[in-house]
């Protein structure tokens, strides 16, 4: 049998267009060989009407094209302005017409829904505007102009030049009479509804000399654009409804039962709880277009989405709309990573962020989702050494463990750090992932002094107490800067006395700074890790002052100063919103497969069973 595949039957109506897709095995030979569309004759031959080599029959001139998509193994034949003469049996095929590499297609073009002669067909999308033109003769120039709709056997008046408007059309119809030079009047209907479809009659005059013109209005539901995305990935819906609705409230909704469409997000500030923390509505351009980004895709996100414009911020009859059918592929290339990470006040979290491993050189970002207005995500840190001012000393983005995962560490946690954070890169936009940080009851596991003052030229020793639960972990001290945390030598001073009910496996590990200089001032972290997987951290600020008395300083937990006040928001903060999220340089699209190794159990503490995957940053 032939390996070519396509539609067996295509049924359409006069004046319409068809688009016939033929599939072939995408071998190298097939991709480059001639593609054709021919009509089968009564005596068995097949006359070529159009081919990929540029031939177009006179029957198809100006109304047909053939496009090959070698990467998909398909070619598409588009034929417009169909007439009943186009009905017949055809073949789409590869190579030479008489060979077997073809598929039989039956095309049937019917007259359409009982159109009268001289009927003008208007085909318009739901929610849009149609202008029905009605010519008349000079003798009817001063007479009544009217538009009727055929309802069953009876014409029903829709609008006339005396000011009547049918209640079904109130507020969305007008009758325009052109200047004296043009013998034409027009009826403009806005916010078209499915119920507006049907046959209309426009008339100038009321007597036997009146001018009449038939019109057939076809209102089309929007064809949903098919969108395939991976579980845990992200999707962007670009919605362009036209400048005529630029100042009308916009919405994205998801169809549920019947014709119901539940608002996902709108420009009036509404947002569905299921999308909290993982959705952004990017402010619209002057032409009224906007986009909605959803991250952390779930199986239940699959379905039909509509974007539209209506003053209520939700779908109403006559809303102009665009549609998508979202398919969520459960065989995802995006690895599982915890969607909830828990930490305690004063403690820390280490968040693992997946990225497309083919894009190891891409810039990595971490941003804080804010729900105000339509949602936005100001950047907090990137992999090029930028950290938002108020996060200095407590936030770091590390390229480790690499190979498809980077790490973000946030310490000195407060209740204000609870919220949703996004991991993203300037590469594959589909790899935006969301994590929620929750602040729970408990004490930090690592114990360090508060702020410490060192004396110039002296030695400073700063202790960090590790409980026995971290006995198998690597313990380290490092100095924080905005590109990471540079490891420093440290000394294991034996078991710690800082923990009740903790055996000899607890540890006191000290950082020693010899001959302190001004350059030693700054933030220092102690922490635990297993290989390239980071666990908890604790931060200490070391201030440096002039010598007051001789000797070295040992800092104990009891001498700890209070933590410094949080720094204020810097005015030049950066964020992922508006144009940035659509900037092709920032988010070039390229799909790829990735996998990441499982983390060592301890480095991500515990993963709660339950509906969300959770990662603990501290003891509970």
């Amino acid at each position: 049998k032939s390996p070519i595949f396509g539609p067996e039957e295509v049924n359409s109506v006069e004046g319409n267009s068809v688009s016939i897709t033929c599939y072939y095995p995408p071998t190298s030979v097939n991709r480059h060989t001639r593609k054709y569309w021919c009509r089968q004759g009564a005596r068995g031959g097949c006359i070529t009407l159009i081919s990929s080599e540029g031939y177009v029959s006179s029957k198809y001139a100006g109304r047909a094209n053939l496009t090959n998509f070698p990467e998909n193994g398909t070619f598409v034949v588009n034929i417009a302005q169909l007439s009943q003469d186009d009905s017949g049996r055809y073949k789409c095929g590869l190579g030479i017409n008489s060979r077997g590499l073809s598929f039989d297609v039956s095309l049937e073009v019917s007259q359409g829904p009982g159109l009268l002669n001289d009927t003008k067909v208007y085909t318009v999308d739901l929610g849009r505007t149609v202008t029905i033109n009605c010519p008349f003769k000079t003798e009817n120039a001063q007479k009544r102009k009217s538009l009727y709709k055929q309802i069953g056997l009876y014409p029903v008046l829709v609008i006339d030049s005396s000011g009547y408007v049918n209640p079904n059309y109130t507020g969305r119809i007008r009758l325009d009479i052109q200047g004296t030079g043009q013998l034409l009047f027009s009826v403009v209907i806005n916010q078209l509804r499915l119920s507006d479809a049907g046959q209309y009659l426009c008339q100038a005059g009321d007597d036997s000399n009146s001018n009449k013109k038939n019109a057939d209005l076809q209102v089309l539901k929007p064809e949903p654009e098919l969108v395939y995305e991976d579980l845990r990935g992200s999707v962007t819906f670009h919605c362009a409804l036209g400048p005529e609705v630029a100042n009308v409230a916009k919405f994205l909704c998801r169809q549920s039962s019947g014709e119901n469409c539940d608002v996902v997000v709108n420009t009036l500030g509404k947002r569905a709880p299921a999308f909290e923390g993982r959705i952004l509505l990017n402010p619209q351009d002057k032409d009224g277009s906007f986009s909605v980004v959803i991250t952390g895709l779930r199986k239940e996100d699959a379905g039909r989405y509509l974007c539209g414009a209506h003053s209520d911020g939700q779908l109403q009859e006559g809303s102009p709309i665009q549609a998508w059918q979202l398919f969520v592929n459960e065989e995802s290339t995006i690895p599982r990573s915890p969607t909830v990470v828990k930490g305690v006040a004063g403690g820390s979290v280490a968040v693992l962020c997946p990225y497309n491993r083919k894009e190891s050189k891409s810039i990595k970002y971490w941003c804080l989702w804010e729900g105000a207005q339509n949602g936005r995500c100001p950047l907090l840190v990137d992999s090029e050494g930028w950290v938002k001012a108020q996060y200095e000393g407590r936030l770091s983005l590390l390229e480790e463990p690499g190979n498809g995962t980077f790490t973000v560490i946030l310490n000195q946690l407060t209740s204000r750090d609870a919220g949703f954070y996004w991991c993203l890169t300037n590469g594959d936009t589909l790899w935006r992932t969301t994590v929620e940080i929750k602040i729970i009851e408990g004490e930090p596991n690592l114990k360090v002094p508060g702020n410490v003052t060192a004396v110039l030229g002296e030695t400073l020793k700063v202790p960090c107490h590790f409980p026995c639960k971290f006995s198998s972990y690597e313990k380290y001290w490092c100095k924080w800067n905005n590109t990471g945390c540079q490891a420093l030598p440290s000394q294991d001073e034996g078991p710690s006395k800082a923990f009740v009910n903790c055996d000899e496996n607890s540890r006191l590990v000290s950082l020693t700074l010899n001959l302190v200089t001004r350059a030693d001032e700054g933030w220092y972290w102690c922490g635990v890790k297993q290989g390239h997987f980071y666990g908890e951290t604790a931060a200490v600020y070391v201030a440096v002052e002039e010598r007051k008395a001789a000797g070295s300083r040992d800092v104990s937990l009891a001498k700890a100063d209070a933590a410094p006040d949080e720094k204020v928001l810097d005015s030049g903060f950066r964020e992922i919103e508006n144009k940035a999220i659509q900037d092709p340089r920032l988010f070039a699209e390229e799909k790829a497969v990735a996998d990441t190794r499982d983390q060592a159990d301890g480095s991500r503490a515990s993963v709660d069973s339950g509906s969300s995957e959770e990662q603990g940053g501290s003891s509970r």
Epitope: N11, V18, S19, Q218, Y228, S256, G258
Partner: nanobody, 130 residues
Amino acid sequence: EVKLVESGGGSVQAGGSLRLSCTASGPTYGRTCMGWFRQAPGREREGVATIETKGLTRYTYYADSVKGRFTISQDDAKNTLYLQMNSLKPEDTAMYYCAADGPGCSGGAFIARGRWYPHWGQGTQVTVSS
């Protein structure tokens, strides 16, 4: 949520006919693609016939094994999909499923045995004896 309910299955002698129906309830905005799939015991699910509506045009696709014997059709007013099965053969014995909202009926989606179809009915059994 879209709900699909099949009916019309049953037992028939080889050479006989059956007409399957599938009634859809739920969202109807631009439903692009509906189809019939079948699965015989111990076999993979396979596409039988699909129908795609784009505006005023309909495209129908059939598996080679049923061409000329089965006809798929749709009644928009009743939101119902049909499969007229003539000249039935014992190898047509299977559970027949209706699927909706596929990502285009043709090519890969058809051959992939409906992997991308989000909505499925419970199925109706067709048994053809020789």
